[in-house]
Interface confidence: medium
Amino acid sequence: IWELKKDVYVVELDWYPDAPGEMVVLTCDTPEEDGITWTLDQSSEVLGSGKTLTIQVKEFGDAGQYTCHKGGEVLSHSLLLLHKKEDGIWSTDILKDQKEPKNKTFLRCEAKNYSGRFTCWWLTTISTDLTFSVKSSRGSSDPQGVTCGAATLSAERVRGDNKEYEYSVECQEDSACPAAEESLPIEVMVDAVHKLKYENYTSSFFIRDIIKPDPPKNLQLKPLKNSRQVEVSWEYPDTWSTPHSYFSLTFCVQVQGKSKREKKDRVFTDKTSATVICRKNASISVRAQDRYYSSSWSEWASVPCS
Amino acid sequence: RNLPVATPDPGMFPCLHHSQNLLRAVSNMLQKARQTLEFYPCTSEEIDHEDITKDKTSTVEACLPLELTKNESCLNSRETSFITNGSCLASRKTSFMMALCLSSIYEDLKMYQVEFKTMNAKLLMDPKRQIFLDQNMLAVIDELMQALNFNSETVPQKSSLEEPDFYKTKIKLCILLHAFRIRAVTIDRVMSYLNAS
């Protein structure tokens, strides 16, 4: 048993039929010694008396909010949560496996630049009785500070018959140098509590591997005289690291017809302009990627040819 | 990144061209190592991230762009402030700090060159003949060192009498390639920055 936060405890249980469970001793937080009684979840049934209560925790029925009283007055609470281990593996019932980039990916993270700021998100089909808390650090043996905000519900989607809820959190490395070469990964730990069930999820990554620039901005077309060609120009996104001559991007320019089946023309360039042929009803899209370290491409920025 | 890319004219700053070749070569070699050594811990998640240049060179600090010298977090381990000599820049543009930056890059290349050559000698003794270092990568390291044009004593290749542990050598190769790729990215950024200024 360990303390998750004040008055909230997690009991780790091997989960199999007829498992013996864990013996837990609860102590009433009071100077009083006599006349103390214990109840569970505001039920009036008295479970025991005395300053300590010993319980055998085997299942969810044994978890919950234990309260000690004296003469009708509440003295203290202890909330017991269960963390299930089945066949040596901690349960992962609360979050959905996103399966990207690989199986058992519960947390996904992205950074728009090298400033040490990143966003992580996760999915669940659970809509109520759910709380998350997030901690992060650089490295684990001698951790360096990363500050994370509160997890918030960022999107709701309908997937077939099911509703899916996306939660996200923003974190910032306390002292990040954008030019630094990372040798220790960022560790992100998410505690998830659904009713009386506790689970924890972790992700480990280098900022350089989760970079996804914002799309290029100010995408513009300039027709060239006496030609079907146009000059496409754009700028680095505002959120990208500076100076741009050090943190350089490379770009992919795509001309896409109205129909998805039409052949796409693609050009790759390190410049912030390109000359392409603009077909009728086509659109021109540009996306960006770190020029030197091939992490994710940005989403497309698009303009119609007309 | 096997894509058609329009690269800038390297004439003005020849080191930029060489550093781009270096990054391409080390990335290809790393990809080859990952594929060939698929049953070895060779991915970024599996390996220990070691930097053989740690405490010996200070490339990131010495080559920090001026704009980042205001960032406290970037100055932690810097005794020196920004960036060069060698034949990469016209002499008008040389400065003491720039020389420090490029000499630090040169020292990095020299250290990795020695390590890679020693490692290749071991890999050539492997009866499985599973993987060898790409000669192109070694040549590109050499070209960039020549373009940087710093005079320094050649470091003798480490020779080892004992029978190599080939498993360990291959893991060390993965560690070295990952670290060298990260350093090659920094070198490319620096060359791009210097070219622009």
Partner: antibody, heavy 119, light 107 residues
């Protein structure tokens, strides 16, 4: 001892607003983990969950009725309220208020209050 | 919404019989299922929560099991006072939904 008791108008006309009150004792909505739900049961039929309010004023509604429902509470008087606007005959039912503790099941139910909608 | 399909709708049994009621959820609801008993003219009473946990004071002839989408409620030895309608309910996800009920009649 935990008790809940529902009260309502008994009878009302279509398009009117139904106001229900749940008065409870034996637990407090000022305490964490506690919440009160409203559930209804048309005569001889099944149960339908309508709305829920937690101690921290977090509210949940059944999406099929959400636009017509409002749940609220007065913890100092140990009361929870439910309003249903624009009622019609399909809203005739016995309405129950229930306590939902940390175990997340409805562990205590009121006796129910019968609501008839007729013109 | 999660649909809870409860079977059978009616059961006619003799005292001493073993009764099995099943509930199938349209999507996984983990172990967040409760079972209630509603005797004629009364409000429902909680018997089982978290799929398999007996509520305080519930006789041990009532048991529940299941996880994910398939849940079972058993009365090992039916008694005359068990005449009632039994409902399953999921509260894994809002809106919390009930099964259609199983009416248990004693011969």
């Amino acid at each position: 001892q935990v008790t809940l008791k529902e009260s309502g108008p008994g009878i009302l006309q279509p398009s009117q607003t139904l106001s229900l009150t749940c008065s409870f004792s034996g637990f407090s909505l000022r305490k964490s983990v506690m919440g009160v739900s409203w559930i209804r049961q048309p005569s001889g039929k099944g149960l339908e969950w309508l709305a829920h309010i937690y101690w921290d004023d977090d509210k949940y509604y059944n999406p099929s009725l959400k636009s017509r429902l409002t749940i609220s509470k007065d913890p100092s008087r140990n009361q929870v309220f439910l309003k249903i606007t624009s009622v019609d005959t399909a809203d005739a039912a016995t309405y129950y208020c229930t306590r939902r503790g940390i175990r997340s099941a409805m562990d205590y139910w009121g006796q129910g209050t019968s609501v008839t909608v007729s013109s | 919404s999660v649909v809870m399909t409860q079977t059978p709708k009616f059961l006619l049994v003799s005292a001493g019989d073993r009764v099995t009621i099943t509930c199938k959820a349209s999507q996984s609801v983990s172990n967040d299922v409760a079972w209630y008993q509603q005797k004629p003219g009364q409000s429902p009473k909680l018997l089982i929560y978290y799929a398999s946990n007996r509520y305080t004071g519930v006789p041990d002839r009532f048991t529940g099991s299941g996880y994910g989408t398939d849940f079972t409620f058993i009365i090992s030895t039916v008694r005359a006072e068990d005449l009632a309608v039994y409902f399953c309910q999921q509260d894994y996800n809002s809106p919390w939904t009930f099964g259609g009920g199983t009416k248990l009649e004693i011969k």
